[in-house]
């Protein structure tokens, strides 16, 4: 990351929150990120979210942490250990694997901080690398070489 | 959200400079959001990262803004219409539909932090929603009612 | 050589459940996907859906609302089970087999005669 | 649905000549990575089930006689009887197995002129 000049917070503002106060997003409502209401099981729907019409289905599970940013994450988890066939969306294909995309995201967490002499001082927000499963892909299986 | 306590930075302390230097992550590195070096073609490699292995393969493209936290993000494209053939790797089996999966990442912006009578006082972090693209999935085409 | 024979209720009341049932002699009811297709009379060939490895159906979206496809293996039978029935559910109803190639259903091989089936109250 | 016509409805072919049905689907039925197209045709004769007689669009079944052909590729097939039998006379069907739901033709109604 790039160097940003210093950010200090005026007087009686306080950074976490206004992060958490943060709520008007003008972003359409997307399908993923939010379980699915389909009927969980290894077949590819012709209707419905994109998780569910995939021929490598997954569901979400929500993982919430509220000492974190965002407290609310979905991780993926695929219904099929194959990918199920584009001629019925029903049996499945084993010339293909269904495998987890996952990623790194950043999120912040709540941390005590600490002035002079170790005495606490309200809390700061640390930034990490959180692993999370984004979605099921269809894949071509290895070649061992 | 729920609502956290109060965050106070210590004197000295300045909250973005601490996210920004957090840099120690725990973390394995991972295939994605990172560009494959992979040929870029309509085919499901055998080998290489989950993106060029895919029958429904994309590329990543690079979005940085040295204003938003996390800087880099990386966008899906798809580099298919519809999904390649398990059977071949190289030809198209128009039965599939090669889509992007999009999701809602939260992102923070730095922006100028405004004291009393409207002075400038350093910078502060707004959260927002950002829409990316993180993958493309091999779906059924939906069926029109 | 393997025979197909279906079997059921020839009369079946208005909104009650058609059941019907295909009995496989022959041959193994395994590794194969099989079919049920209905012919109203005087008319043309419906497919109703079909069931692959005992277990992964595909109905007509006209009918799947309706329909049940399943598979016995100890008795080596496949069962159709159509629920609300009217007059328009008519017709000789076939069961068959169809080839499998390569992870994919091909096409219907082997027929049996049909039973037919009338709606009437 | 991929909807399955046929043409002509019926046809009248005299003993020993040739007999040409026609079959279009509304998209392709082909896939190009194992070159084969999803398309069958069955022979319906009177108070009997279909027969098989043609797969993969141009593949004979077991038994079938030579007569017998199928031909096209993508959305467009035929069906010909080389030299028509008096026990060719039957309705035939063509349907498509690419994608689920499966669709037949309406069929074409073959007699002796």
């Known amino acids: 990351y790039s160097h940003w000049p210093s950010c200090c917070p005026s007087k009686g503002q306080d950074t976490s929150e206004e992060l958490l106060r943060w709520s008007t997003v003008p972003v359409p409502p997307l399908e993923p990120a939010r379980p699915n209401r389909h009927p969980e099981s290894c077949r590819a729907s012709e209707d419905g979210p994109l998780n569910s019409r995939a021929i490598s289905p997954w569901r979400y599970e929500l993982d919430r942490d509220l000492n974190r940013l965002p407290q609310d994450l979905y991780h993926a988890r695929c219904l099929c250990p194959h990918c199920v066939s584009l001629q019925t969306g029903s049996h499945m294909d084993p010339r293909g694997n269904s495998e987890l995309l996952y990623h790194n995201q950043t999120v912040f967490y709540r941390r005590p901080c600490h002035g002079e002499k170790g005495t606490h001082k309200g809390y700061c927000l640390e930034r990490r690398l959180y692993r999370v499963s984004l979605a099921c892909v269809c894949v071509r299986p290895r070649v061992m070489g | 959200y729920s609502h956290w306590p109060s965050c106070c930075p210590s004197k000295g302390q300045d909250t973005s400079e601490e996210l920004l230097r957090w840099s120690t992550v725990p973390v394995p590195p991972l295939e994605p959001a990172r560009p494959n070096r992979h040929p870029e073609s309509c085919r499901a490699s055998e080998d290489g990262p989950l993106n060029s292995r895919a029958i429904s393969p994309w590329r990543y493209e690079l979005d940085r803004d040295l204003n938003r936290l996390p800087q880099d993000l990386y966008h899906a494209r798809c580099l298919c219409p519809h999904c390649v053939s398990l059977q071949t790797g190289s030809h198209m089996d128009p039965r599939g539909n090669s889509e992007l999966l999009y999701h809602n990442q939260t992102v923070f912006y730095r922006r100028p932090c405004h004291g009393e009578k409207g002075t400038h006082k350093g910078y502060c972090l707004e959260r927002r929603l950002y829409r990316v693209s993180l993958a493309c999935v091999c779906v059924r085409p939906r069926v029109m009612g | 050589q393997v025979q197909l024979q279906e079997s059921g209720p020839g009369l079946v009341k208005p909104s009650e459940t058609l059941s019907l049932t295909c009995t496989v002699s022959?041959?193994?009811?395994?590794?194969?996907?099989w079919t049920w297709i209905r012919q109203p009379p005087g008319k043309g060939l419906e497919w109703i859906g079909n069931i692959y490895n005992s277990e992964n159906t595909n109905y007509n979206p006209s009918l799947k609302s309706r329909v049940t496809i399943s598979v016995d293996t100890s008795k080596s039978q496949v069962s159709l089970k159509l629920n609300s029935v009217t007059a328009a559910d008519t017709a000789v109803y076939y069961c068959?087999?169809?080839?499998?190639?390569?992870?994919?259903?091909?096409?219907?091989?082997?027929w049996g005669q049909g039973t037919t089936v009338t709606v009437s109250s | 649905d991929i909807v399955m016509t046929q043409f002509p409805d019926s046809l009248a072919v005299s003993l020993g000549e040739r007999a040409t049905i026609n079959c279009k689907s509304s998209q392709n039925v082909l896939i190009t990575s194992n070159n084969k197209n999803y398309l069958a045709w069955y022979q319906q004769k009177p108070g009997q089930p279909p027969k098989l007689l043609i797969y993969?669009?141009?593949t004979r079944e077991f038994g079938v006689p030579a007569r017998f052909s199928g031909s096209g590729s993508g959305t467009d097939f035929t069906l010909t009887i080389s030299s028509l039998q008096a026990e060719d006379v039957a309705v035939y069907y063509c349907q498509q197995y690419y994608s689920t739901p499966f669709t037949f033709g309406p069929g074409t109604k073959v007699d002796i002129k």
């Open positions: 022959g041959g193994s009811i395994n590794s194969y996907s």
């Open positions: 068959a087999r169809t080839y499998n190639w390569n992870y994919e259903i091909g096409a219907m091989g082997v």
């Open positions: 993969w669009a141009s």
